[in-house]
């Protein structure tokens, strides 16, 4: 990661409150669970919850902790240390190209295909022709059978940490 | 005592470019948050940016993100602030200063001009 | 236009006190410090409070800060004539993730 952080996602802390640990920089950087004070002097320890940082660094501030968007389940709360991890509900997906909303998955394939992959929460099922087994653009159809599918179980998160 | 000298003002126009910089003395310089703060003539304070004591960390205002670069020179003491694409808006004087949330030393300022 | 909120002006008798209020959001004021500056005209800002509350050496007792939810207040005492001057509240903004200050208000000691 690039040790250049410009504003995005900073969290609302400043000085540090009397209950928040501080420890010293080392070579003018503070581990991860902490940001630096303004004069350099002190490593100031992120809030449980409301903010992170996962590397070294010598940030003004934490970073904000992610919240999970409705229709989104919460794998891993946000520590210290680490985002949280947010996952499309069952029956939802997130596109690479459309990550900021999950989408409902297809109940089924076009004509002429046949499923051969289940809705996961990081993918719509999978349909391929039934002659050549070539794959399905991915448009929803304009008229669909009554092949129908279960959503997938989750398997591996789809993490929004920063 | 601390002390924040601001230099590189002067006349520019539109879509020039300038560098500001300030000499800071009186304290151990290289730990420091460091902001660039503005006031055009006649109006309030505006924030411009901050920079880490490494330069690791650097914030900048939207008015002026893209156009304008913070950086720090530890070994000389210095805050630099570049400035390109300049509009007739950032037309004020530029304060340097101590820390960043709530700088607590300001430099007497040096003032740039665009117009054409 | 100020993401804080100043009055424009504020006067007093010497010898009278004044109070200048700082009107902000949960975003600024209500989860992070306030500073106090003064500027007198062609000087740069001076910083009278940090931290809400606290007073930089140098700077004398007649001027306090407060903070309450999203509002901030400096009060100044036995208002002097070299009082007269622009005084302005900043802290920083988490959604902007800015340094904000308020427009500014003008003391002046009738």
């Known amino acids: 990661e690039s040790a250049l952080i410009t504003q995005q996602d900073l969290a609302p802390q400043q000085r540090a409150a009397p209950q928040q640990k501080r420890s010293s920089p080392s070579e003018g950087l503070c581990p991860p669970g902490h940001h630096i004070s303004e004069d350099g002097r002190d490593c100031i320890s992120c809030k449980y919850g409301q903010d992170y940082s996962t590397h070294w660094n010598d940030l003004l501030f934490c970073l904000r902790c992610t919240r999970c968007d409705s229709g989104e389940v919460e794998l891993s709360p946000c520590t210290t240390t680490r985002n949280t991890v947010c996952q499309c509900e069952e029956g939802t997906f997130r596109e690479e190209d459309s990550p900021e909303m999950c989408r409902k998955c297809r109940t089924g394939c076009p004509r002429g295909m046949v499923k051969v992959g289940d809705c996961t929460p990081w993918s719509d099922i999978e349909c391929v022709h039934k002659e050549s087994g070539t794959k399905h653009s991915g448009e929803v159809p304009a008229v669909e059978e009554t092949v129908t599918s279960s959503p997938g179980t989750p398997a591996s998160p789809c993490s929004l940490s920063g | 005592e601390v002390q924040l000298v601001e230099t590189g003002g002067g006349l520019v126009q539109p879509g020039g470019s300038l560098r500001l910089s300030c000499a800071a003395s009186g304290f151990t310089f290289s730990p420091y948050y460091m902001s660039w703060v503005r006031q055009a003539p006649g109006k309030g304070l505006e924030w411009v940016s901050a920079?880490?004591?490494?330069?690791?960390?650097?914030y900048y205002a939207d008015s002026v993100k893209g156009r304008f670069t913070i950086s720090r020179d530890n070994s000389k003491n210095t805050l630099y602030l570049q400035m390109n694409s300049l509009r007739a808006e950032d037309t004020a004087l530029y304060y340097c200063?101590?820390?960043?949330?709530?700088?607590?030393?300001w430099g007497r300022g040096t003032m740039v001009t665009v117009s054409s | 236009q100020s993401v804080l909120t100043q009055p424009p002006s504020v006067s007093a008798a010497p010898g009278q006190k004044v109070t200048i209020s700082c009107s902000g959001s949960?975003?600024?004021?209500?989860?992070?410090?306030v500073s106090w500056y003064q500027q007198v005209p062609g000087t740069a800002p001076k910083l009278l409070i940090y931290?809400?509350?606290k007073r930089p050496s140098g700077i004398p007792d007649r001027f306090s800060g407060s903070k309450s939810g999203t509002s901030a207040t400096l009060g100044i005492t036995g208002l002097q004539t070299g009082d007269e001057a622009d005084y302005y509240c900043?802290?920083?903004?988490?959604?902007?993730?800015?340094?904000?200050f308020g427009g500014g208000t003008k003391v002046t000691v009738l």
């Open positions: 900043g802290t920083w903004d988490s959604s902007l993730s800015a340094l904000v």
């Open positions: 931290d809400n509350n």
């Open positions: 920079i880490s004591g490494s330069g690791g960390s650097i």
């Open positions: 949960t975003s600024n004021i209500g989860n992070n410090y």
């Open positions: 200063a101590r820390g960043a949330s709530g700088p607590d030393y």
